[in-house]
């Protein structure tokens, strides 16, 4: 029995619903009374949802899963996962049994966009060319871990003297803090780019220092 799932991971935003697609080819004369379907976590084999004896046996996964009952008879064994959380990320196996059996695993990739970075400067007054300043770029509640890039006003990457830390909160979402230590020129713009590698989403922040005063676009 051939069971088909998408090759590419299913990407779902935190808090939204995701559909884990799974299908099989019913034979002529197939009825739901013949179908047994199991969804489980691939690694731990934890039961997620099942269908047996012609009936939906229900969710065993925090009551956040559902089948598509009207589509099962056509061979659509997909699973709806509601209110996706970071902890849901991983591989799910769809096991179908009729008079033969088959299974396939589909990956769920969870993502959350990062907020627009906020920029802070230390020290933040009486600055002169030649002073060393610390610029902090902070972006919040994203997933997975971000990639952080710094550049100057001419677009030249700044890779030295950068320290980036990422801390997960209780929901598993990351807060990013990246610190750039730089010696001030006569004036200049310093930009921070926080990239979500899954969503290919970039969040920009910048600070421009022009003698006095400083501006934070």
């Amino acid at each position: 029995l051939e069971v088909q799932v998408p090759e590419d991971p299913v990407v779902a935003l935190v808090g939204t619903d995701a559909t884990l697609c799974c299908s099989f080819s019913p034979e002529p004369g197939f009825s739901l009374a013949q179908l047994n379907l199991i969804w489980q976590l691939t690694d731990t084999k934890q039961l997620v949802h099942s269908f047996a004896e012609g009936q939906d046996q229900g969710s065993a996964y925090a009551n956040r899963t559902a089948l598509f009952p009207d589509l099962l008879a056509q061979g659509n064994a997909s699973l709806r996962l509601q209110r996706v959380r970071v902890a849901d990320e991983g591989s799910f196996t769809c096991f179908v049994s009729i008079r033969d059996f088959g299974s396939a695993a589909v990956s769920l990739q969870v993502a959350a966009p990062y907020s627009k970075p906020s920029m802070t400067l230390e020290p933040n007054k009486d600055l002169r060319p030649g002073d060393t300043v610390t610029i902090t770029c902070s972006s919040y509640r994203g997933y997975p871990e971000a990639e952080v890039f710094w550049q100057d006003g001419q677009g030249v990457p700044l890779t030295g003297n950068v320290t980036t830390s990422q801390m997960a909160n209780e929901q598993g979402l990351f807060d990013v803090h990246s610190v750039l230590r730089v010696v001030l020129g006569a004036n200049g713009t310093y930009s921070c780019l926080v990239r979500n590698p899954v969503l290919q989403q970039d969040a920009h922040g910048s600070v421009t220092i022009t003698g006095q005063p400083m501006t934070f676009p």
Epitope: A33, K45, S50, A52, E53, S97, R99, F101
Partner: antibody, heavy 118, light 110 residues
Framework: EVQLLESGGGLLQPGGSLRLSCAAS????????MHWVRQAPGKGLEWVAA????????YYADSVKGRFTISRDNSKNTLYLQMNSLRAEDTAVYYC???????????WGQGTTVTVSS | QSVLTQPPSASGTPGQRVTISCSGS????????VNWYQQLPGTAPKLLTY???LRPSGVPDRFSGSKSGTSASLAISGLQSEDEADYYC???????????FGGGTKLTVL
Amino acid sequence: EVQLLESGGGLLQPGGSLRLSCAASGFSFSSYGMHWVRQAPGKGLEWVAAINSDGSRIYYADSVKGRFTISRDNSKNTLYLQMNSLRAEDTAVYYCTKYYYHYAMDVWGQGTTVTVSS
Amino acid sequence: QSVLTQPPSASGTPGQRVTISCSGSRSDIGATTVNWYQQLPGTAPKLLTYQSHLRPSGVPDRFSGSKSGTSASLAISGLQSEDEADYYCASWDASLNTWVFGGGTKLTVL
């Protein structure tokens, strides 16, 4: 008539190897999953291994994983069980069974006896 | 130790009704279904009921299966001497990815 006929059993020493065969007839062998189930003397039934119709999905009991290999040749309507590193506790009657709806096994062979003893 | 739990023995007199229980869990009987097998002395097992309550052709309607939650039972009414045999329940265990049998119940017709 649907029939399953096992062969290949015998007496051998611990550490030995043996290949069991199951010849199927009377049904479309290539459309059904198949199992091996065993029964030690005076004991209950123990599921050993299962293979789906085209051999793409295989499952084993933990007690035989890494030592036994289930396979099939649909052109010959035959199911196999290759048993390596045999132990005394593998002594049993081995049944070949046909998969049926709802995880059931609706046709059983007469069984072949494997005895592992030094 | 079997994943599915059955009483080791049961007995009854001819004509009586006897019930054999099978206790499982959320990941086997609770998630899927249960099948029952009869093994007469010296013979291969035979499928008695499947999908908890269906009978293959040729199985008398004296045999009936049922399931409730994570447990199942096999009832034999109008007990006959030829019913003396071992009875096994079986299921698929989704947490083990294996087929599982109960330990078997030896039915004696007194």
